[in-house]
Interface confidence: medium
């Protein structure tokens, strides 16, 4: 059998970093090792291209100002998966200044139903649902450097955590036959 | 504007850990911080339930021994997304002893086409395609502790990297109208 890697160690205490130790709001170096390369993660990699094309930020609410498209095969032959899908989605930039990466691209289904490939139109006989995936991020939170209850201005503790990120949509039979 | 977190630092040199420093093949503690909780990542969390139900391991080849199901609404009303989808998929356990986590659940589309919701049968007029997502993992590789070219037995260097993991399938219009 291959060797057991064991479970990650559990450290109860989090180090509190001063403003001086954190250059320009960056996370501590030991949490940002060379090879992590967060920009390789798809929800991060997509941000730059979305910003370049002027995609909207969060807080408009799901599907705000969106419309389930009428799908025309000749228009999507060369398109990406999210546009060719019969449960199409778009990407929205989610921003959180207390998270690294601060900006993530999250998927939003454009249709409640799915698109009938033959007619190109939405059908309520099927449902579009999000596919969620876990993403490892760094979270920062104010902390106290002197042991008191009050946070020290500009000081932060950091920890890694998994968050659920919608990465796309798939088309399913509804749970109810109604 | 929220503060810039900057890019992860780049460290050219990787520390080479001896067998004594690595208890039972575990990764170094600083790479397995408390809050990483890899077992929360979906491709990891699914492994235990898959093993419990006797799912097959890798290396049988994609779709080996699988079949595109006939979808019957009454049978999948309470099923999970991967079974209710008209581009259904199953999970396979991918094992790599030089990666942490060693075991990951990866999605495999069960159909080349998609399932016609009305007939329950596969149609070639549409394609099932994988949705890929990035997952941060630890990678270990043999290394030399004495500066020579030959690796020291039982010694490993570690780095983190993003790998592309199929997390589900979606149904798309084909790229070609043929």
């Amino acid at each position: 059998d291959p060797p057991s890697w064991g479970k990650p160690r559990s450290h109860r205490t989090l180090r509190c970093y001063s403003a001086e130790e954190l250059s320009h709001g960056q996370a501590p170096p030991h949490l940002l090792t060379r090879s992590a390369r967060w920009e390789q993660a798809l929800p991060v990699a997509l941000v730059a291209s979305l910003e370049a094309t002027g995609h909207r930020r969060q807080h408009e609410g799901p599907l705000a100002g969106t419309q389930c498209p009428v799908l025309r095969p000749e228009e999507v032959l060369e398109a990406d998966t999210h546009e060719r899908s019969i449960s199409p989605w778009r990407y929205r930039i989610d921003t959180d200044e207390n998270r690294y990466p601060q900006k993530l691209a999250v998927a939003e289904c454009l249709c409640r139903g799915c698109i009938n490939a033959k007619t190109g139109r939405e059908t309520a006989a099927l449902n579009s649902v999000q596919l969620l995936q876990s993403l490892l991020v760094l979270r920062r939170q104010p902390c106290s450097r002197d042991g008191t209850a009050d946070p020290t201005p500009g000081s932060f503790a950091f920890h890694t955590e998994f968050i659920r990120v919608p990465v796309g949509c798939t088309c399913v039979l509804p749970r109810s036959t109604q | 504007d929220p503060p810039s977190w900057g890019k992860p630092r780049s460290h050219r040199t990787l520390r080479c850990y001896s067998a004594e420093e690595l208890s039972h093949g575990q990764a170094p503690p600083h790479l397995l911080t408390r809050s990483a909780r890899w077992e929360q990542a979906l491709p990891v969390a699914l492994v235990a339930s898959l093993e419990a139900t006797g799912h097959r391991r890798q290396h049988e080849g994609p779709l080996a021994g699988t079949q595109c199901p006939v979808l019957r609404p009454e049978e999948v009303l309470e099923a999970d997304t991967h079974e209710r989808s008209i581009s259904p998929w199953r999970y396979r356990i991918d094992t790599d002893e030089n990666r942490y986590p060693q075991k990951l659940a990866v999605a495999e589309c069960l159909c080349r086409g998609c399932i016609n919701a009305k007939t329950g049968r596969e149609t070639a007029a549409l394609n099932s395609v994988q949705l890929l997502q990035s997952l941060l993992v630890l990678r270990r590789q043999p290394c030399s502790r004495d500066g020579t070219a030959d690796p020291t037995p039982g010694s490993f260097a570690f780095h983190t990297e993003f790998i592309r993991v199929p997390v589900g399938c979606t149904c798309v219009l084909p790229r070609s109208t043929q």
Epitope: Q67, E122, A125 | -
Partner: antibody, heavy 120, light 107 residues
Framework: EVQLVQSGAEVKKPGESLKISCKGS????????IAWVRQMPGKGLEWMGF????????QYSPSFQGQVTISADKSISTAYLQWSSLKASDTAMYYC?????????????WGQGTLVTVSS | DIVLTQSPATLSLSPGERATLSCRAS??????LAWYQQKPGQAPRLLIY???SRATGIPARFSGSGSGTDFTLTISSLEPEDFAVYYC?????????FGQGTKVEIK
């Protein structure tokens, strides 16, 4: 009872505007496409376009694109067909019809029709 | 656009007789074909969809057959209320199109 009820007959002059309506009841109006179909005097049926009341997505027949506008108000379960400038050739019976659940363009419920007469 | 050609244009029959109506498509429409009945002063009514499936409430004397480009609507034994105009319609391609109609009249 599932039904579509259309507004009454209209007599208009060329160049005038017009908006006719189709109100659905007895089913989930928002989740079915509504089609508009034209039947000129003594002639056959011609599909004009669709609207999905849930989000007002539309699809037009190339023959009618730009000639008419299809809209809907989902809050009152009503679809509309309108002209900004009528022509004598618009004289016809106009039907609204419900597309079947799977959007295969089979019309399983029809309105009673609205007769539009355009004459100077 | 797909052109549907119906024949004959008029069919003169007596009650109790069998009526056979034809619809030919200019391109393959698979089984995505429907039949409608329209009586004078009324809206059309869906009879058959998917070439051979009877719509809700349609009597068993109405049946549809065919696939590809050639389709048939059969009325096994004409009732007085069956004399009307019948249209076929394809939904294989957008735009959906109708045939020009076949009138079934009393002989």
């Amino acid at each position: 009872e599932v039904q579509l009820v259309q507004s009454g007959a209209e007599v208009k002059k060329p160049g005038e505007s017009l908006k006719i309506s189709c109100k659905g009841s007895g089913y989930s109006f928002n989740n079915y496409w509504i089609a508009w179909v034209r039947q000129m005097p003594g002639k056959g049926l011609e599909w004009m376009g669709f609207i999905y009341p849930s989000n007002s997505a539309t699809q037009y027949s190339p023959s009618f694109q730009g000639q008419v506008t299809i809209s809907a108000d989902k809050s009152i379960s009503t679809a509309y067909l309108q002209w900004s400038s009528l022509k004598a050739s618009d004289t016809a019976m106009y039907y609204c019809a419900r597309d079947n659940e799977y959007s295969d363009s089979y019309f399983d419920v029809w309105g009673q029709g609205t007769l539009v007469t355009v004459s100077s | 656009d797909i052109v549907l050609t119906q024949s004959p244009a008029t069919l003169s029959l007596s009650p109790g007789e069998r009526a056979t109506l034809s619809c030919r498509a200019s391109q393959i429409v698979s089984s995505y074909l429907a039949w409608y009945q329209q009586k004078p002063g009324q809206a059309p009514r869906l009879l058959i969809y998917d070439a051979s499936s009877r719509a809700t409430g349609i009597p068993a004397r109405f049946s549809g057959s065919g696939s590809g480009t050639d389709f048939t609507l059969t009325i096994s034994s004409l009732e007085p209320e069956d004399f009307a105009v019948y249209y076929c319609q394809q939904s294989e391609q957008v735009p959906t199109t109708f045939g020009q109609g076949t009138k079934v009249e009393i002989k």
